[in-house]
């Protein structure tokens, strides 16, 4: 039960000695700075007070500092994702120092153990920012801590304990048990960097999460609602592992927020923007796309720094690989009435077709239910980018003149006589774009044919200026 | 185990100063935040701020920026708090605690009076 | 700020009956509330941490529960000794703020 996993290990315990450590010659906490760029080659080891091997390992004290910190290991090994983000961090600042914290020997023990030892390893790695500071022209304000999983928290206890206050941490999915819920100073927190970002993955909503699900940063992005992430399904993993077992998903959803943050740094001509919003289900429905006053972002290495007072919860679509850009759409709909429904919800489906490309037929979701003589919004998005929006098409699923539909309509017709046929009317869609933060808005193209039934489609094109909403300085200054 | 002995009661002038001390025993003192809170008579609690022995480093609440000032020694593993420019609405018991899970262990409380 | 309201001063109960403490956060705290206990001149103590997991020592009839905004502390078989102000506190962000206290009366 989760009460297995409540926090251990406190001032009580002389908490600062690690926990199950087998007494071996190899330092339970090392610094590897990877000066090669070829991944596999070991790098060089930093040790505290040294400043001879600082010089040998080509440690260059003015360029900015990244400190990558893993987490919980099963294997006691370096998982690939390491690799891949040293290469992309040299890749896009190349005169930095990239330097591993390599506390394996903490980590490979049971996950309650482990979490007793990021406190200490936390206070290493403070130990050796605190060093390096009383060389002149090293800044505390350079360097940047990246912690995964377990080892989000681990940077958040050393930025804890630093003299001064580190510039940036970046939690990657930062673990969930034994940290939802507890004190600040037990976890990473706002306070331990001039800037925290925190990518959430794999936040379940129910039974044991094993991504922290409540916000811990400035701002706490949470992918695709920061749950199911597109690839991972079950499916998608007996596809691209050997064995598809349950723990390659969670290794899938969990990891993802290392992928998306490499992502961030190739792929620098693709940004992933976020939308802040109060929760994934109003994001769903498409009611956060805006850009104003800081309520967008760039994820990942890119997202610019927004100190507010209180968390700023963000979301967005990706696709299932890199780059894991897409498009955000938001349309709002007015639904003029909607005939004989019943209590089942149209499928709706839309096509956006643009000066770049067309998208493939996009399911309106429908989140709660459809509102009848109201504008409901929904969000859509492609994975390329179409350009300008020039048409569209709304297609209602179903038979048109199926024998089910004709029984149906028939006993429609005896229950309400005078409404036969299920339809819809719509007149116009207004579409937001979230990366352009451009809106327009689409009319029938003959005003007297904005009726739809299922097995049918509407075309819309941009509305002629008798159709637009007058005003001077934006004519959808009123649609927002 | 655990313990946190503050310095005794105080009577002061208004516009004085006063300095309370927390001494702490029983655990690595340098490593662990120790917060200041406030309870006026008849008064819930306030939360004053905190101090990281260790790296100097103090959070407050904006309420009592520049009437509360946190320092530490860790070498006698002494936390204090000083008080300036005391008025009327100072006088309280003052309590240090040591926070992990929440405010895990706490001194005995230090009253502070207040009067001409 | 945070605000942390405990609706009452005030709850009056006999020993052996069950006693339910509310507390109400302005915002959403998540499961990072704790529960203190503070008899008549005496220090307060904690007993609750993380919304429900019982501190060191603290006997088993003393349960927290709730999270996001709304939580409970509930004293199953209340005792004599247990007569005492009860204050909740978020541990989610700076500033910590506590409830206003309730005060526990032995009938």
């Known amino acids: 039960s989760i009460t297995t996993l409540r926090p251990q290990g406190s001032l009580r315990d002389e908490h600062h000695k690690p926990t199950g450590v087998p007494a071996t010659a190899r330092p339970s906490v090392a610094f590897n700075i990877r000066t090669s760029k070829d991944p596999e080659q070991e790098g060089c080891n930093l040790s505290l007070g040294d400043s001879k091997l600082l010089e040998n390992c080509g440690f260059n004290m003015t360029a900015k500092t990244f400190f990558i910190i893993h987490g919980w290991t099963m294997s006691g090994m370096f998982e690939s994702w390491l690799h891949k983000l040293v290469s992309a961090l040299q890749m896009r600042e190349k005169d930095a120092n990239v330097v591993v914290v390599d506390w394996l020997p903490l980590a490979h023990q049971l996950y309650t153990d482990a979490v007793n030892n990021t406190r200490v390893v936390g206070q290493r790695v403070a130990g050796m920012l605190d060093w390096l500071q009383e060389k002149e022209e090293f800044s505390l304000g350079n360097v940047h801590l990246i912690g995964y999983s377990l080892g989000a928290h681990v940077a958040g206890y050393a930025g804890n304990f630093v003299k001064g206050t580190v510039g940036r941490i970046t939690g990657l999915d930062p673990a969930g048990p034994m940290f939802e819920g507890v004190d600040i100073n037990r976890r990473l927190s706002p306070d331990d960097a001039d800037f925290v970002d925190v990518l959430h993955t794999y936040t379940l909503s129910f039974g044991l999460s094993i991504g922290i699900r409540m916000p811990v940063g400035h701002i706490d992005i949470y992918p695709n609602g920061g749950d199911f992430q597109p690839g991972c399904g079950f499916n998608d993993v007996i596809g691209s592992f050997a064995y598809g077992t349950i723990s390659e998903m969670v290794k899938c959803e969990h990891e993802r927020a290392v992928h998306l943050f490499v992502d961030s740094l190739v792929n620098q001509d693709k940004p992933s923007f976020a939308f802040q919003c109060t929760d994934s289900s109003r994001f769903k429905r498409g009611i956060c796309l805006s850009c104003r006053k800081n309520r967008c972002n760039n994820i990942g290495y890119n997202a610019k720094k927004m100190r507010k007072k209180r968390n700023s919860k963000m979301y967005l679509k990706t696709r299932a690989g890199m780059p894991f850009k897409v498009y955000h759409y938001q349309l709002k709909v007015h639904m003029f009435s909607y005939n004989n429904s019943g209590d089942t919800q149209p499928t709706l489906y839309i096509t956006l077709y643009g000066s770049n490309a067309d998208s493939q037929n996009l399911p309106l979701e429908i989140v709660e239910k459809i509102e009848l003589n109201a504008t409901n919004t929904f969000l859509v998005y492609t994975e390329e980018d179409l350009g300008d929006l020039l048409k569209m098409r709304l297609t209602w699923e179903g038979v048109a003149h199926s024998w089910y539909n004709l029984w149906n309509e028939f006993r429609n017709y005896l229950s309400q006589p005078s409404n036969p046929s299920r339809e819809l009317y719509i007149r116009r869609i207004r579409v937001k774009s979230g990366e352009t933060q451009r809106k327009v808005t689409f009319c029938t193209q003959d005003p007297t044919k904005s009726s739809i039934s299922p097995g049918q489609e509407l075309w819309f094109h941009k509305c002629q200026d008798g159709w637009k909403m007058k005003n001077k300085t934006s004519p959808f200054v009123n649609l927002a | 185990q655990v313990q946190l002995q503050q310095s005794g009661a105080e009577l002061m002038k208004p516009g004085a100063s006063v300095k309370i001390s927390c001494k702490a025993t029983g655990y690595t003192f340098s490593t662990y935040w120790i917060a200041w809170v406030k309870q006026r008579p008849g008064h819930g609690l306030e939360w004053i701020g905190e101090i990281l022995p260790g790296s100097a480093k103090t959070k407050y609440n904006k309420k009592f920026k520049g009437k509360a000032t946190f320092t530490a020694d860790t070498s006698s593993n002494t936390a204090y708090m000083q008080l300036s420019s005391l008025t009327s609405e100072d006088s309280a018991v003052y309590y240090c605690a040591v926070y992990d899970y929440g405010a895990d262990y706490w001194g005995q409380g230090t009253s502070v009076t207040v009067s001409s | 700020d945070i605000v942390m309201t405990q609706s009452h001063k005030f709850m009056s109960t006999s020993v052996g009956d069950r006693v339910s403490i509310t507390c109400k956060a302005s915002?959403?705290?998540?499961?990072?509330v704790a529960w203190y206990q503070q008899k008549p001149g005496q220090s307060p103590k904690l007993l609750i941490y993380s919304a429900s997991y019982r501190f060191t020592g603290v006997p088993d009839r003393f349960t927290g529960s709730g999270a996001g905004t709304e939580f409970t502390f509930t004293i199953n078989s209340v005792q004599a000794e247990d007569l005492a102000v009860y204050y909740c506190q978020q541990h989610y962000s700076i500033p910590r703020t506590f409830g206003g206290g309730t005060k526990l009366e032995i009938k």
């Open positions: 915002q959403d705290v998540y499961t990072a």
